[in-house]
Amino acid sequence: EEELQVIQPEKSVSVAAGDSATLNCTVSSLIPVGPIQWFRGAGPGRELIYNLKEGHFPRVTAVSDPTKRNNMDFSIRISNITPADAGTYYCVKFRKGSPDVELKSGAGTELSVRAKPSAPVVSGPAVRATAEHTVSFTCESHGFSPRDITLKWFKNGNELSDVQTNVDPAGKSVSYSIRSTARVLLTRRDVHSQVICEVAHVTLQGDPLRGTANLSEAIRVPPFLEVTQQSMRADNQVNVTCQVTKFYPQRLQLTWLENGNVSRTEMASALPENKDGTYNWTSWLLVNVSAHRDDVKLTCQVEHDGQPAVNKSFSVKVSAHPKEQGSNTAAENTGTNERNIYGGSG
């Protein structure tokens, strides 16, 4: 008598999530009499997937009519496949009895589920960094299968190389996650720059998914400060200008100090944007030279985006050089960021 064979012809089957999977199984003999059951996994923890005789298996149907005389095809179809259905499926022949006795198992068919990765989510640093510093961006995508996946980073269309990528878990799983970190060197020109995380996977048919982050969220461009004096007016008033240039973001507070005392405080708002995304701002202060007997120390103090204040100081020299009265000549910049501006007293 020929020994019963349980034949599972496919060692593996791959199905897209949402589709149906057909798991084939035939037996070589009708004898002995007894049922076929399908299990996922082996050993004491195996799960019953289909038993024609009893149980409710709403997603599983027999491919052939199992009640038909001389039926030797016990293939099944599982509908609406999800990643959780992945595993090795065994077609098992039992001999009829009380209880039925397990006789022979097929070699097993490994079902793998192709699942699309989720849209990549890119997150940047929690706090802004200044130009010439390196910041890290992370990109995450989840729920894909099989494990093979490609992730690339781009900054303004150029691929980044300082990248570390991990796919978890390391071994076989129903689905996988990818997490990648890219280190990006910021420059003063990066306000309008963008980083893109691009994920390619077999389920995407060559149309990769992209996640983006704007460097404007991560960068701080500190301002340049320039203090100049306009021509002295006939009424002995000196017009002093503090030019604050090339800064980002717009959040900026400027304070004028006269001899250490607050003269005026201004907040930047609704500034026009430069081509590179930075901002400029100019503030004027009129100093009445005739009202002062001694030299006046003026300070332009700028607090940008919550950072420590930056000062630019200079002195208006009263009656020191009457011959230079009304001149437009700026003095040498001293080591203490001071300008000496000479004016005559009335």
Epitope: P44, G45, R46, T88, E102, P169, G171
Partner: antibody, heavy 122, light 112 residues
């Protein structure tokens, strides 16, 4: 090549909870049973229990009320928690992989960790 | 629970000579599929156990062919055709038919 590494405290006080973790490297959690086995000093092997990749657990009946085995597939780790320990729980604890190819039984405990010594003492 | 009983518990051996260890189970380990759920392990001094034989007679990967397993039902034998010095340690049989998995008491093999 699959390797297993046990980690956890070497000294536990009586009545407290013993917690051990086994990290699986170089291979997959799926399709295997993940077992804890212990060996008291100078004695033989005692199976504590195992967990299948699908989350189903099986325990030694004498320890069932005190033991929990759990699986973290994202970290490729499985863990043992044993409550209300006594001096009788002093042993070398091994984590191990058990194979299952088909049928109802198992096909050998083929990969073992190096073992971690746990002493229960105040 | 299935009880596993080994004999002898101690086995002095001479290198180059054969050796044999017996294992008996309290119920048959031959399943209806024809598979025998009996394994043999060796625990060398200071080391973890290693799988030698599974399924009653199949050698595990990397195990020398001087080790062989035989038997069916409830009586099993592990044979070493020519003992080598590295074979010293404690040999355990274990059943994998049903939970709880159980092991024999162990047979300590030492050089005479």
């Amino acid at each position: 090549q699959v390797q297993l590494q046990e980690s956890g405290p070497g000294l536990v006080k009586p009545s407290e909870t013993l917690s051990l973790t086994c990290t699986v490297s170089g291979g997959s959690i799926r399709d295997y049973y993940w077992s804890w086995i212990r060996q008291p000093p100078g004695k033989g092997l005692e199976w504590i229990g195992f967990i299948y990749y699908n989350g189903r657990t099986f325990y030694q009946s004498s320890l069932k009320s005190r033991v929990t085995i759990s699986l973290d597939t994202s970290k490729n780790q499985f863990s043992l928690k044993m409550t209300s320990v006594t001096a009788a729980d002093t042993a070398v604890y091994y984590c191990a992989r058990v194979r299952a190819y088909s049928g109802i039984g198992l096909d050998g405990t083929d990969v073992w960790g190096q073992g971690t010594t746990v002493t229960v003492s105040s | 629970d299935i009880v596993m009983t080994q004999s002898p518990l101690s086995l002095p051996v001479t290198p180059g000579e054969p050796a044999s260890i017996s294992c008996r189970s309290s119920q048959s380990l031959l399943y209806s599929t024809g598979y025998t759920y009996l394994d043999w392990y060796l625990q060398r001094p200071g080391q973890s156990p290693q799988l030698l034989i599974y399924g009653g007679s199949s050698r595990a990967s990397g195990v020398p062919d001087r080790f062989s397993g035989s038997g069916s039902g409830t009586d099993f034998t592990l044979k070493i055709s020519r003992v080598e010095a590295e074979d010293v340690g404690v040999f355990y049989c274990g059943q994998a038919l049903q939970t709880p998995l159980t092991f024999g008491q162990g047979t300590k093999v030492e050089i005479k």
